[in-house]
Amino acid sequence: MKVLQEPTCVSDYMSISTCEWKMNGPTNCSTELRLLYQLVFLLSEAHTCIPENNGGAGCVCHLLMDDVVSADNYTLDLWAGQQLLWKGSFKPSEHVKPRAPGNLTVHTNVSDTLLLTWSNPYPPDNYLYNHLTYAVNIWSENDPADFRIYNVTYLEPSLRIAASTLKSGISYRARVRAWAQCYNTTWSEWSPSTKWHNSYREPFEQHHHHHHHHHHH
């Protein structure tokens, strides 16, 4: 039994780090392998992660950690019974993948404006709480070409857009993801998408003017 693709890990900079690797053949990860991880200098016992299968030869492990400190460095040991297959280290602050934002809501009660709000996935005492920026993806269910990304570079987890920038009378979906420049993180996964019907109507004056103009011709 050998490791074909060495473990690579990402941290949510809160309580979970996820490590993935590939073996050289089909493996029952949970029964055959163990990933031991320990904070460097920690005097208490190393923690054990039981991996799950991630495809035939792939394994994934979710390492439970205490809240992360920027200098944290972990040793990682991948064992198959009494055989050490791989030894490495992992610094969570250098491999951050933020948690996905949640509770994405589209407020359509203001006729000419769409307000999208979502929740910051971190508690206020986490360093990333005040360092996340977001990308909001809006797309039409009817037209695959109607696909747009809005970058939200301010801290407030919300986005206002004019309803008129979207087509009227059709359904749209939105989703949001996050990243933090301070730790040069990867993007988070997308949040679950939310759907709404864009029923924007042009103001009466515009309709009236338009019809009058049309009549002229």
């Epitope: 200098f41 005097l43 208490s44 016992e45 950690m65 205490d66 400190v69 200098a71 005492d125």
Partner: antibody
């Protein structure tokens, strides 16, 4: 309930020896790092010895290095501190403490045992 | 070894008052800092670790902040049972960890 109970303290003459014990219960002793911390009368806390969960790694400050030895018997759930060549300045309450599971902060402490070094 | 200082060395405060104790270190310890409370004749009690995370069972009136070389312990609304000596302790790097000299908090 986590409990740490120290014993073995007492009056000893300068140059003498003493062995402190700490009986642990209420947790899986063999998975935790442990330490001895002392406090001289009216003074602050001083870490005098640490040992990792399997006993393979120990550490001491210069003030006790070569004189004190920390050890553990995981089968007996007991931590020890062997103190040799004792000096007057070693007089203190000696606490046994457990290191937190994820960090090297001490989350549980015993009630302490008093060691008095005097002629 | 990393040197630890605490200020003030002692203070007297009234019930309900907000109290702040500062701990400084001679070099960057990131957030590897714990706080303990000790009452006369008793062992220390674990309050805070990672500079800001409350230990289990610690009332929410206690909070910690800071990173690098300067840290604070705050008690937002002092209770009579909060008197005692407060110690900070760093646990950065290999096990040569030191405690601060302590801050004695007396209730007025």
């Amino acid at each position: 309930e986590v409990q740490l109970v120290e014993s073995g303290g007492g009056l000893v003459q300068p140059g003498g020896s003493l062995r402190l014990s700490c009986a642990a219960s209420g947790f899986t002793f063999s998975t935790y790092g442990m330490s001895w911390v002392r406090q001289a009368p009216g003074k602050g806390l001083v870490l005098v010895a640490t040992i990792n969960s399997n006993g393979g790694s120990t550490s001491y400050p210069d003030s006790v290095k070569g004189r004190f030895t920390i050890s553990r018997d995981n089968a007996k759930n007991t931590l020890y501190l062997q103190m040799n060549s004792l000096r007057a300045e070693d007089t203190a309450v000696y606490y046994c403490a457990r290191f937190f599971r994820f960090r090297n902060a001490m989350d549980y402490w015993g009630q302490g045992t008093l060691v008095t070094v005097s002629s | 070894d990393i040197q630890m200082t605490q200020s003030p060395s002692s203070l007297s405060a009234s019930v309900g008052q907000r109290v702040t104790i500062t701990c400084r270190t001679s070099e960057n310890i990131y957030s590897y800092l714990a706080w303990y409370q000790q009452k006369q004749g008793k062992p220390p009690r674990f309050l805070i670790y990672n500079a800001k995370t409350l230990a289990e069972g610690v009332p929410s009136r206690f909070s910690g902040s800071g990173s690098g070389t300067e840290f604070t312990l705050t008690i937002t609304s002092l209770q009579a049972e909060d008197f005692g000596v407060y110690y900070c302790q760093h646990y950065y790097g290999p096990p040569t960890w030191t405690f601060g000299p302590g801050t004695k908090l007396e209730i007025k």
